[in-house]
Every structure is written in structure tokens, then in C-alpha cells.
Interface confidence: medium
């Protein structure tokens, strides 16, 4: 267990950037920061869950830009951003810092939030090391910050996985509790016998493995128990031989502000009441005015620091602050073996060759396995397919017999005859053309520019 700490030093236009301020809104506004930690060095969507934790800074001082005045040193929020982590520090991580502007009013009033900058830093960092300084550019902006990871006692080490024990192995008095305070100096591994339990064994000489009371075995992994007092923890009582409850991770309740403690293997977990968070429920004072609900979550309650707030999350998000994105790809929306990508603002399917469409639902090669009946031919294109039917047939698969005369294609009283290659119109006197659409003028000249050779007015006209 431990805490990642981030200190923002400055935020403003970078060298060569426009001489403008992030406060250039149409009214008073203030800055705040959000930090998001993800394990590993992989490229991830900015909206993917902050698996190692996230934190929101306090709001900075309210600032109103003075027209034509040079931008002063920008007022930033006070204090550190702290992200508690319960488990081992991973060493490699992605750090995402977002700078937000809260606009407190303009001609149409009310606050609004704009994401000014988002910087992502991927690197390796050992817990317990010194502050690491950094300067990052985001567009025209420059962010200067420092950060470190530190373990919280009794955890120590570069990953906060070793438990610190006093160098002098003290004996316990009547309270059956360890009586020496934890010291900064810890046993340097590997002094004890290989495999000696880190939790229940200790050593004063290299190569030995001595057990804390209540544990036995060559590596101190076997709990001492008797039939009359199974399951109890702690050193055995000399009078009864039973285990007397000894020190446990939840003894003394490390959870502040009414949090309830539950034991986890070798550690503890605090379930915090609403309005509090952190490893020990020590972080409080967040109200709806601080905008604790991310991703469009609706904040209710929490009008003052003493009352709790609740985030009602929009579809697709969860977590007490709506900070976790539901994995929408788990529903397997992409068909035909397409690869699902949750981009945050939308789902995308990367289709396999031969498939297309928003969900890869169109088979571009469908003609390979598609038969068009009655001499029809399959036509591909545009991510879809269709049958081009032979004359006299129609429908999706060319299985329906089409009556070319059903639509009464012959004009001016012409009579329609179905023909193997289409239809033929026998025109009424005075009309000609493939559909009898052209009147023959009294002087015997038709309205056609030129009649095909050998055709006389009144002749049947074949419609190809």
C-alpha cells in the first residue's frame, strides 16, 4: 500500500505559444486538475478506467481576466494530488494529467467545464525514490509538475511489498501486542531462511526462520491450533493453550470517518461512507460544486462538505465517481469475427477481410455462395450484393416471374405483348415508338428525330 503524489508547478502557454491565458473565458473561471494512473506502459484510450486510481485537485482561485492586461502568474490549486494505491506499486505506469477550466459564468450564465489539456507520460518509477520533475507540452500549453510514489508503513521497498519490522525483535508484555514502534530501518532481505514467511516469521541471524507466536513449521506457515479454539488468531495463552486474539490489520480500526474495515490477505480494506474516499477514508470535503462525477455523471446531494454526494452515472459508466467505463466490447457487437474497439465516444469494429459495415455485418464476398435463379447474375458493390435478373424475372433472388406488361407500359392505347426478350407494344393508329409515346403528325412526319431504317408508323415496337 502507498500513495502516488503529484505536484503541479505551473500551467500556461509554452515557449513560442500564443501569449494567452487559460483563463480567457467570458467571465470568471478557475482551473483544476485530474490525475489518472494506469498500470503498464501500453497505449490506452484516455477514457479507459484508471485502474491504479484517480484523483481530483481542489479548485484554484477564481480569476477574471483583465482586458489588455498581461497575463499574471496563473493561480493554481493548492496542495498535492494524492492517489492512494492498495496493492503493490507496479513500477511501470501511465500517468494522465488533465487540466480543466471551470467557467463560472458568461452572458448565458452558469458554470461549464472545458478540458484544456491532457498529457500522458509513460515511464518507470520505483516507490520510495525522490521527486521526479517533468515538463510536458499539450498543444500550445505547457505543464510543469513533479511526482513520486511512496509506501505507507509498514510497507516498504520499490514496490511497497515488503513489510517493515523493527530491527530489534521485541518481546511482548501482558497486552500480547508488539510493543516496539515500527522503525525506519527494516530487515534487509534475504537474511532469513529462503521461503520464511514474510508475515509470520522473522530472523535475528542470517539463515534462520523463527516464528511469531501462533505460527509454527520450518517456514512459519502452519498456524498453531487446538481442537477447542480453531480459527482464532494470535499468540497462544500459556494458561489455556488456546490462541488469544492477536494483532490483526483491522485492530484499532484504521479506517477514518466511520469507514468499516475488512481484512484482506496480509492487509485491510476500508469501505468508506459516502463523501469520503482514500485508503483509510481520509479524503473528504468533496461536494457537487467540485464536480466529482466524471463522464457526464449527474451529481446529487453534497451541497456542503458535511453532506455526502452521489454520482448517477450515464449508460456505459460505473464507479462511485463514474470514472470506470463499462466494457461494451464484452457484448461482442462485432459480427463475422470483427475486432471490437471501445474508443470511448463510440464503438468501432475492425472487420476481417471480406466484411464491412458498422458491425461487420455485410459480407462483401456474398456472391461466392449466392445463387441467383433463372439466369440472374450476382452483383457486388458498396458492401452489399444484389441479383441482376434476366428479363422476365424479378425479386431478390430472381425467383419471381415478372410480367413486363403488368405496369401497362404502352402509351396511348397501345397493346402490350410479353416477349422472351422483353415486351412489344402494338401502337394504336397515329402513334409510334417503343412505348407508343410519339404521335405521328398529319403530314406523316413523326415526332422522332429519325426512325430506324425499315420502320413504319404503326409497326409494333420492341422494347429492349
Amino acid at each position: 500500500a502507498g500513495v502516488f503524489e503529484l505536484q503541479i508547478h505551473s500551467f500556461g502557454p509554452g515557449p513560442g505559444g500564443a501569449p494567452r491565458s487559460p483563463y480567457s473565458a467570458r467571465g470568471p473561471c478557475r482551473l483544476f486538475f485530474r490525475v489518472c494512473l494506469k498500470p503498464g506502459l501500453s497505449e490506452e484510450a484516455a477514457e479507459s478506467p484508471c485502474a491504479l486510481g484517480a484523483a481530483l485537485s481542489a479548485r484554484g482561485p477564481v480569476y477574471t481576466e483583465q482586458p489588455e492586461a498581461p497575463a499574471p502568474d496563473l493561480p493554481l490549486p493548492n496542495g498535492l494530488l494524492q492517489v492512494p494505491f492498495r496493492d503493490a506499486w507496479p513500477g511501470t505506469f501511465s500517468l494522465i494529467i488533465e487540466t480543466w477550466r471551470e467557467e463560472l459564468g458568461d452572458q448565458i450564465g452558469g458554470p461549464a467545464w472545458s478540458l484544456l489539456a491532457r498529457v500522458t507520460r509513460r515511464r518507470r518509477l520505483a516507490a520510495g525514490g525522490p521527486w521526479a520533475g517533468d515538463i510536458q507540452r499539450a498543444g500550445a500549453w505547457e505543464l510543469r509538475f513533479s511526482y513520486r510514489a511512496r509506501c505507507e508503513l509498514p510497507a516498504v521497498g520499490t514496490a511497497c511489498t515488503r513489510l517493515c519490522r523493527p530491527r530489534s525483535a521485541s518481546r511482548c508484555g501482558p497486552g500480547l501486542r508488539p510493543c516496539a514502534p515500527l522503525e525506519d530501518e527494516c530487515e534487509a532481505p534475504p537474511v532469513c531462511r529462503a521461503g520464511c514467511s514474510l508475515e509470520h516469521g522473522f530472523c535475528e541471524q542470517p539463515g534462520e526462520c523463527r516464528c511469531l507466536e501462533g505460527w509454527t513449521g520450518p517456514l512459519c506457515m502452519v498456524p498453531v491450533s487446538t481442537s477447542s479454539c480453531l480459527g482464532l488468531r494470535g499468540p497462544s495463552s500459556t494458561t489455556t493453550g488456546c490462541l488469544v486474539p492477536g494483532p490483526g490489520p483491522c485492530d484499532g480500526n484504521p479506517c477514518a470517518n466511520g469507514g468499516s474495515c475488512s481484512e484482506t490477505p496480509g492487509s485491510f480494506e476500508c469501505t468508506c461512507p459516502r463523501g469520503f474516499y482514500g485508503l483509510r477514508c481520509e479524503v473528504s470535503g468533496v461536494t457537487c460544486a467540485d464536480g466529482p462525477c466524471f463522464n457526464g455523471g449527474l451529481c446529487v446531494g453534497g451541497a456542503d462538505p458535511d453532506s455526502a454526494y452521489i454520482c448517477h452515472c450515464p449508460p456505459g459508466f460505473q464507479g462511485s465517481n463514474c470514472e470506470k467505463r463499462v466494457d461494451r466490447c464484452s457484448l461482442q457487437p462485432c459480427r463475422n469475427g470483427g475486432l471490437c474497439l471501445d474508443l470511448g465516444h463510440a464503438l468501432r469494429c475492425r472487420c476481417r477481410a471480406g466484411f464491412a459495415g458498422p458491425r461487420c455485418e455485410h459480407d462483401l464476398n456474398d456472391c461466392a455462395g449466392r445463387a441467383c435463379a433463372n439466369g440472374g447474375t450476382c452483383v457486388e458493390g458498396g458492401g452489399a450484393h444484389r441479383c441482376s435478373c434476366a428479363l422476365g424475372f424479378g425479386g431478390r433472388d430472381c425467383r419471381e416471374r415478372a410480367d413486363p406488361c403488368a405496369a401497362r407500359p404502352c402509351a396511348h392505347g397501345g397493346r402490350c405483348y410479353a416477349h422472351f426478350s422483353g415486351l412489344v407494344c402494338a401502337c394504336a393508329p397515329g402513334y409510334m415508338g417503343a412505348r407508343c409515346e410519339f404521335p405521328v403528325h398529319p403530314d406523316g412526319v413523326s415526332a422522332l428525330p429519325a426512325a430506324p431504317p425499315g420502320l413504319r408508323p404503326g409497326d409494333p415496337q420492341r422494347y429492349p
Partner: nanobody, 116 residues
Framework: QVQVVESGGGLVQPGGSLTLSCAAS????????VNWYRQAPGKEREKVAR????????NYANSAKGRFTLSRDNAKNRVYLQMNNLKPEDTAVYFC?????????WGQGTQVTVSS
């Protein structure tokens, strides 16, 4: 490339309703505040409404309060301006504007005419 396209304008009688839609592509839609502006002939462009990048905050000009409703769908990269009880003085070209600290994108506008 960046595209901002407004639609849904048209001719409507006083007291009627219209929903303007604004579709965008080519940029990180969900990080932008969206403003709707309008410009009537011979007048300056005025801001009618705005919605924050997350959709949690909406603000309206006095002329639009109680009649207009602005919403956004970040999954579809769309913004909607629902206009009810329209008046002749709402006649204007309506523009969709995406605003962020480092950039500004405008559409070409859609004409709304309120007339009997």
C-alpha cells in the same frame, strides 16, 4: 478532415417546433463545449445556448430560456437543439460551434424561418 454540419432548419408557423441537429467528425467531439449561435439579417451573431463537453451543464440566453433545450450524444457525435413555441423573432441562420481552448469549429448554418 473536420466537418460540422447543421440540419433540421425550415419554415415553421409561430408557436411551432423544430429540432436542429449538428453532426461533427474529424476531431475529439467529447472534449468540446458546443455553442449554438444565430444571426438574423442585419444583426450581430448571438449565442443562444451552450452545453459543456460532458453534457452536464447547459446555459441559455434569456431569449431562449424555457423554450429551447440543448442536448448532446457523445456516442453519436451529435448535438440537438429542440426549439418549441417559436416566434417570428427566432427567424435566423443557426450555427453550430465547437469550442475548446485550442480550436474552434463552425458549421455553415441552417436557416430557420418563423412565419405565418
Amino acid at each position: 478532415q473536420v466537418q460540422v454540419v447543421e440540419s433540421g432548419g425550415g419554415l415553421v408557423q409561430p408557436g411551432g417546433s423544430l429540432t436542429l441537429s449538428c453532426a461533427a467528425s474529424g476531431f475529439d467531439f467529447s472534449t468540446y463545449t458546443v455553442n449554438w449561435y444565430r444571426q438574423a439579417p442585419g444583426k450581430e451573431r448571438e449565442k443562444v445556448a451552450r452545453i459543456s463537453s460532458t453534457g452536464t451543464t447547459t446555459n441559455y440566453a434569456n431569449s431562449a430560456k424555457g423554450r429551447f433545450t440543448l442536448s448532446r450524444d457523445n456516442a453519436k457525435n451529435r448535438v440537438y437543439l429542440q426549439m418549441n413555441n417559436l416566434k417570428p423573432e427566432d427567424t435566423a441562420v443557426y450555427f453550430c460551434n465547437f469550442e475548446r481552448f485550442d480550436s474552434n469549429y463552425w458549421g455553415q448554418g441552417t436557416q430557420v424561418t418563423v412565419s405565418s
